[in-house]
């Protein structure tokens, strides 16, 4: 059974995939697909890297971590309740049946809805939510900047996001590896 | 546009082993997006996958010839081979090399066919 | 290994007709599901992959659908030169599996 990753409407999903370079620089291919892993390839790919580089992409797919050290998981962008389902991430391993295949089923919520006095500033305009990204896009930053009047909730809310934030950090670093060669 | 061009014999003694060599016109063996195979059909019979070999290396065989099979690929020569090792009358059919784009799996070429007769 | 289970075995038509050919399969294959014309002498062409996109090159009077484990091909209107084997191709689990094939001849 596949393992499920959640992320909220608007936000970015983040689904994990490793492998260990033979050494550093020397890549295998790599797809990532929307729906299960089949026989060769990735059904409807959204991602492909080769030996060198990320060789094709489609908007929102891009890959967040440092690919050349084996880090090929899909950051999708601004998800959608569409976006829900399962994806595949194939590392083609050179060699007699040796690749490897995971399938990550991703679950999209819908955003939650805090309602907020009128005269407070929206809750995601005074806590800009910003993964640090490297090496697709501009450099940005988690930051909570001057506090300005919030309730209880939004303070839960906060909480909760930056335990969320925590846990994708865990996931991320606790993830499955594959080592090569 | 990819051409396949086969070629070997098309009578093996049983026991001996089956070689096929499928060499490629009009595009690299060694560039990304193709995954060359093999595929044979006995005779009045449907057909059966026997496995291929990836642009990366990576190979896959059918598990019932698992054990008899070896699919090459050779770079400098623009070919990838089919040997078949112990071969009995069962192994009597015709086998097509084929190479299956990868980038969507919309197109796909395929060899004449090899007529290959296992017969003392 | 998955088994694919193609009916009719034989399908006889006249030019002009439409043809329904079905393919089930004995586990789900999700979209993975290719169909292949072959005609005597000739080694098979790719007609559809992904259950329902036509492959390059391919007349539109081909179209295929279904998800699971149920597919069907349509040929809208045969022409001579259709006449001949069709199979359905797996491409979810190893090993790659076909169906037996149905054969479209001229009634």
């Known amino acids: 059974s596949e393992v499920e990753y959640r992320a909220e409407v608007g936000q970015n999903a983040y689904l994990p995939c490793f492998y260990t370079p033979a050494a550093p620089g020397n890549l295998v291919p790599v797809c990532w697909g929307k729906g299960a892993c089949p026989v060769f390839e990735c059904g409807n790919v959204v991602l492909r890297t080769d030996e060198r580089d990320v060789n094709y992409w489609t908007s929102r797919y891009w890959l967040n971590g440092d690919f050349r050290k084996g880090d090929v998981s899909l950051t999708i962008e601004n998800v959608t309740l569409a976006d829900s389902g399962i994806y595949c991430c194939r590392i083609q391993i050179p060699g007699i049946m040796n690749d490897e295949k995971f399938n990550l089923k991703l679950v999209i919520k819908p955003a939650k809805v805090t309602p907020a006095p009128t005269r407070q500033r929206d809750f995601t305009a005074a806590f800009p939510r910003m993964l640090t990204t490297r090496g697709h896009g501009p450099a940005e930053t988690q930051t909570l900047g001057s506090l300005p009047d919030i309730n209880l909730t939004q303070i839960s809310t906060l909480a909760n996001e930056l335990r969320d934030s925590r846990l994708a950090n865990d996931l991320r670093d606790s993830g499955a590896t594959i080592r090569i060669g | 546009q990819v051409q396949l061009q086969q070629s070997g014999p098309g009578l093996v003694k049983p026991s001996h082993t089956l070689s096929l060599t499928c060499t490629v016109s009009?595009?690299?063996?060694?560039?990304?997006?193709?995954?060359w195979s093999w595929t044979r059909q006995h005779p009045g019979m449907g057909l059966e996958w026997i496995g291929y070999?990836?642009?990366?290396?990576?190979?896959y065989y059918t598990p019932s010839l698992k054990s008899r099979l070896t699919i090459s690929v050779d770079t400098s020569k623009n070919q990838f081979s089919l040997k078949l090792s112990s071969v009995t009358a069962a192994d009597t059919a015709v086998y097509y090399c084929?190479?299956?784009?990868?980038?969507?799996?919309?197109?796909?070429?395929w060899g004449q066919g090899t007529l290959v007769t296992v017969s003392s | 290994e998955i088994v694919l289970t193609q009916s009719p075995a034989t399908l006889s038509l006249s030019p002009g007709e439409r043809a329904t050919l079905s393919c089930r399969a004995s586990?789900?294959?999700?979209?993975?599901l290719a169909w292949y014309q072959q005609k005597p002498g000739q080694a098979p062409r790719l007609l559809i992959y992904?259950?329902?996109n036509r492959a390059t090159g391919i007349p539109a009077r081909f179209s295929g659908s279904g998800s699971g484990t149920d597919f069907t091909l349509t040929i809208s209107s045969l022409e001579p030169e259709d006449f001949a084997v069709y199979y359905c191709?797996?491409?979810?689990?190893?090993?790659?599996?076909f169906g037996g094939g149905t054969k479209v001849e001229i009634k």
């Open positions: 084929a190479s299956l784009d990868s980038w969507g799996s919309n197109r796909d070429y």
């Open positions: 009009g595009g690299s063996i060694s560039s990304g997006g193709y995954y």
């Open positions: 070999i990836s642009y990366s290396g990576s190979i």
């Open positions: 586990q789900s294959v999700s979209s993975y």
């Open positions: 992904d259950a329902s």
């Open positions: 191709q797996q491409r979810s689990n190893w090993p790659l599996t």
